[in-house]
């Protein structure tokens, strides 16, 4: 995971948020786990980052991800209170200058180094779900969510007429 030398960890002072154009409305550090409480971990292998879904040993620290929350101008159908009404999008960054990105051609989720402003592939619409879970929908491909497939993160197409509570697209955020 990101405890390895040479990989900068997040400190109390989060990312410098002075991005040109769109700017986040709040930021926080959290660990990401699946509905079944498996941890999402990140490892440096052959000069590239791999993302794993695994059971963590008890003494092993969970990897933290910087979540930056952005408001979309599109109205949210979920808040339902007429006050904030805006959809939330997030970017997820497990280490400085690297962000999770959707690769729609390969149906995969990858970690890429990129500069701001971030590409649309790095933005995911945040959905609140039951059981204190969330799901992440690709901004670039509505109906496609980050999900778990064969112990890896993948992009999974979800039919809106079916149950969006499908366990493999549900994630938990914890400090």
């Amino acid at each position: 995971a990101f405890g390895i030398s040479g990989v900068p960890k997040y400190t109390r002072a989060l990312h410098d948020s002075s991005i040109t154009g769109i700017s986040p409305i709040t930021e926080s550090l959290a660990s990401l786990s699946t509905y079944n409480d498996q941890s999402i971990t990140f490892a440096l292998e052959d000069e590239s980052y791999e993302i794993y879904v695994e059971d963590l040993k008890k003494d092993k620290k969970k990897d933290k991800v910087l979540l930056s929350y952005y408001e979309s101008q599109h109205p949210s159908s979920e808040s339902g209170d007429g006050v904030d009404g805006k959809m939330l999008m997030v970017t997820l960054s497990p280490t400085k200058d690297f962000w999770l990105q959707a690769n729609n051609k390969e149906h995969s989720v990858e970690l890429h180094k990129c500069e701001k402003p971030l590409p649309d592939q790095a933005f995911f619409v945040l959905h609140n779900r039951s059981f204190n879970c969330v799901s992440f929908e690709c901004k670039t491909d509505p109906g496609v969510f980050i999900g778990v497939k064969d112990n890896h993160l993948a992009l999974i197409k979800v039919d809106y007429s079916e149950n969006l509570g499908s366990e493999n697209i549900l994630f938990k955020l914890s400090e």
């Epitope: 109390r12 002072a13 989060l14 990312h15 948020s17 700017s23 986040p24 409305i25 709040t26 930021e27 926080s28 550090l29 959290a30 929350y69 408001e71 979920e78 808040s79 339902g80 209170d81 007429g82 006050v83 904030d84 805006k86 939330l88 945040l126 609140n128 204190n132 969330v134 955020l173 914890s174 400090e175």
Partner: antibody
Amino acid sequence: EVQLVETGGGLIQPGGSLRLSCAASGFTFSFYAMSWVRQAPGKGLEWVSAISGSGGSTYYADSVKGRFTISRDNSKNTLYLQMNSLRAEDTAVYYCARTIHGIRAAYDAFIIWGQGTLVTVSS
Amino acid sequence: EIVLTQSPGTLSLSPGERATLSCRASQSVGINLSWYQQKPGQAPRLLIYGASHRLTGIPDRFSGSGSGTDFTLTISRLEPEDFAVYYCHQYSQPPPFTFGGGTKVEIK
């Protein structure tokens, strides 16, 4: 209409206990982190405590840690603040407040505030 | 605990003038900072969140700027209803969250 209504305030002797309630309506309560903020007469705002949407994470100001307990009942759309070992310096109007966005975590500004309930600790 | 220091404590201005309120954090809070207006006998009212995002319905004479440790609330042209107390509030991770001591904007 989105609304927060605090109840439970009153006059209490030092060392006593009181439980404040905050009834929420007009929004999906479990989606939002909630906080208690207080304001002593003629003074500024002081954040007291916060709780995540699920109730799984709670946070306290140092001044109330070990004496106050925040909790929520999502089935009743209600937030609570149990206050024990009350002191004269706890005298204040207590507001409950809701975060802007349904992030469930506590890291957000407060958009909805109740009207406040006055707690007076005096012998 | 992160300490927020607001200055000045009191600002005496006339309607139509520009008000500049400062909030300094004892350590970085990123962009996790908001501004509230409070009038006597009322609950606080959110104006700005995420350091620079104006809440829907708040007049555009209110603007926020800054990140890290130094933040500013600017009221470009004071209206009679703007005379009130203004508080900054940080909600950076991890808690405790804190409020600044407030700046009173009064009529000169």
